[in-house]
């Protein structure tokens, strides 16, 4: 004959441990039932009657079957540099994300305690490793032939474009200028400039200097950060 | 803490060679570009040059390209400068700086070594 | 190459003063200034960049500000700490300090 199914509250056997959903009471010394996700324990149960669960009141939560008496408060509103990617409802925790152009600085459980903004890379410097959720942009110095005149989170070193004749070099942080004529290409064989892999790395070694980032022209240079009060836009 | 630790001061001879270390700590080294600065006695401050310490890229000063060599070395988190044929023009302190390359330029320095070149 | 110059290259004030020292850029260097101060025996100290920034834990007394190719440093309230050789740095351009100013007290 089929075991009999036991209805909580129940005695457990000797030796054996309460079914899924349920659990071991030390004071009235049975297996009862859990509350359900977005509930909590209301009365706790006893030999003869069984646990009584309530829905949790507003702004707070259970994510999880569970015996608590109270439950969980739902973490504080985002902030102005969050986002919030998940609401806070009676079976899950509000989870706030950093927004677009920031990272996580300081992780939490789930979602993030600190935003910090991505780090923008001056003009001479590319962006050698993009930021994502949780680390920072990593800036490095254009190589020769390639440039940036921007400040951007995102922006690479590109090459500077060839000329049939240069009326101004480029440099780290300024596209070569031609003359009237049209360029040859407008890029550089390669594309673009990536950080070069890890193997490479030079140790104890000289590699040969870049050539200075300091053109002697006073014009054609890159749009510098802006006063905070008075808009982005440079001179 | 972001910390760069310079070595102690270096007496040279007139001709003879330097090495100035700086070791960084606090922050991942391979991050940022290390400059170079110079200060002569009661003097102002001169910048020498820069090295990415993840590729060895550098870049100098023309003044400074014939005198020093920027090296580094990734896996002990430090920087080096070497001050070839020592004169007494070289006689100066010189420091270390990490820079970003964003607009937050040189936030952390070494404290200083002292050169003295003298016969 | 940009030259940069700083005046004036000693300055005398009282503590409470409202000090102001400049730098002037010989060609555009389009906001990438830097000031540092330098005490005495000690390494230099970021205070502003970008021209405008306050380095964090910079005393809200020190400002930067620009007209055309001039920048400015201002301290608000002179104070006794504050006695120290001041470079501003232009990065746009390659890298440059200026001769600097010595701030000391009256």
């Known amino acids: 004959l089929p075991a009999q199914v036991a209805f909580t509250p129940y005695a457990p056997e000797p030796g054996s441990t309460c079914r899924l959903r349920e659990y071991y009471d030390q004071t009235a010394q049975m297996c009862c039932s859990k509350c359900s996700p977005g509930q909590h324990a209301k009365v706790f149960c006893t030999k003869t009657s069984d646990t009584v669960c309530d829905s949790c009141e507003d702004s707070t939560y259970t994510q999880l079957w569970n015996w608590v008496p109270e439950c969980l408060s739902c973490g504080s509103r985002c902030s102005s540099d969050q986002v919030e990617t998940q609401a806070c409802t009676r079976e899950q925790n509000r989870i706030c994300t950093c927004r677009p152009g920031w990272y996580c600085a300081l992780s939490k459980q789930e979602g993030c305690r600190l935003c910090a903004p991505l780090r923008k890379c001056r003009p001479g410097f590319g962006v050698a490793r993009p930021g994502t959720e949780t680390s920072d942009v990593v800036c490095k110095p254009c190589a020769p032939g390639t440039f940036s005149n921007t400040t951007s989170s995102t922006d690479i070193c590109r090459p500077h474009q060839i000329c049939n004749v240069v009326a101004i070099p480029g440099n780290a942080s300024m596209d070569a200028v031609c003359t009237s004529t049209s360029p040859t290409r407008s890029m550089a064989p390669g594309a673009v400039h990536l950080p070069q892999p890890v193997s490479t790395r030079s140790q104890h070694t000289q590699p040969t200097p870049e050539p200075s980032t300091a053109p002697s022209t006073s014009f054609l240079l890159p749009m510098g950060p802006s006063p905070p009060a008075e808009g982005s836009t440079g001179d | 803490e972001v910390h760069l630790q310079q070595s102690g001061p270096e007496v040279g001879r007139p001709g003879s060679s330097v090495k100035i270390s700086c070791k960084a700590s606090?922050?991942?080294?391979?991050?940022?570009?290390i400059h170079w600065v110079k200060q002569s006695p009661g003097q102002g401050l001169e910048w020498m040059g820069w090295?990415?310490?993840?590729?060895?890229?550098?870049d100098y000063a023309d003044k400074f390209k014939k005198k020093a060599t920027l090296t580094a070395d990734a896996s002990s988190n430090t920087a080096f400068i070497h001050l070839s044929r020592l004169t007494s023009e070289d006689t100066a302190t010189y420091f270390c700086?990490?820079?970003?390359?964003?607009?937050?330029?040189?936030?952390?320095w070494g404290q200083g070594t002292s050169v003295t070149v003298s016969s | 190459n940009i030259q940069l110059t700083q005046s004036p290259s000693l300055l005398s004030a009282s503590v409470g003063d409202r000090v102001t020292l400049s730098c002037n850029g010989s060609?555009?260097?389009?906001?990438?200034l830097a000031w540092f101060q330098q005490k005495l025996g000690e390494a230099p100290k970021l205070l502003i960049y970008?021209?405008?920034s306050l380095q964090t834990g910079i005393p809200s007394r020190f400002s930067g500000s620009r007209s055309g190719t001039d920048y400015t440093l201002t301290i608000s309230s002179l104070q006794p700490e504050d006695v120290a050789t001041y470079f501003c740095?232009?990065?746009?351009?390659?890298?440059?300090f200026g001769a600097g100013t010595k701030l000391e007290l009256k």
């Open positions: 740095f232009q990065y746009n351009n390659g890298y440059m």
């Open positions: 970008s021209t405008y």
């Open positions: 700086a990490r820079d970003d390359g964003s607009p937050l330029v040189m936030d952390a």
């Open positions: 606090g922050y991942t080294f391979t991050d940022y570009i």
């Open positions: 090295i990415d310490p993840d590729y060895g890229n550098t």
């Open positions: 060609q555009n260097i389009d906001n990438y």
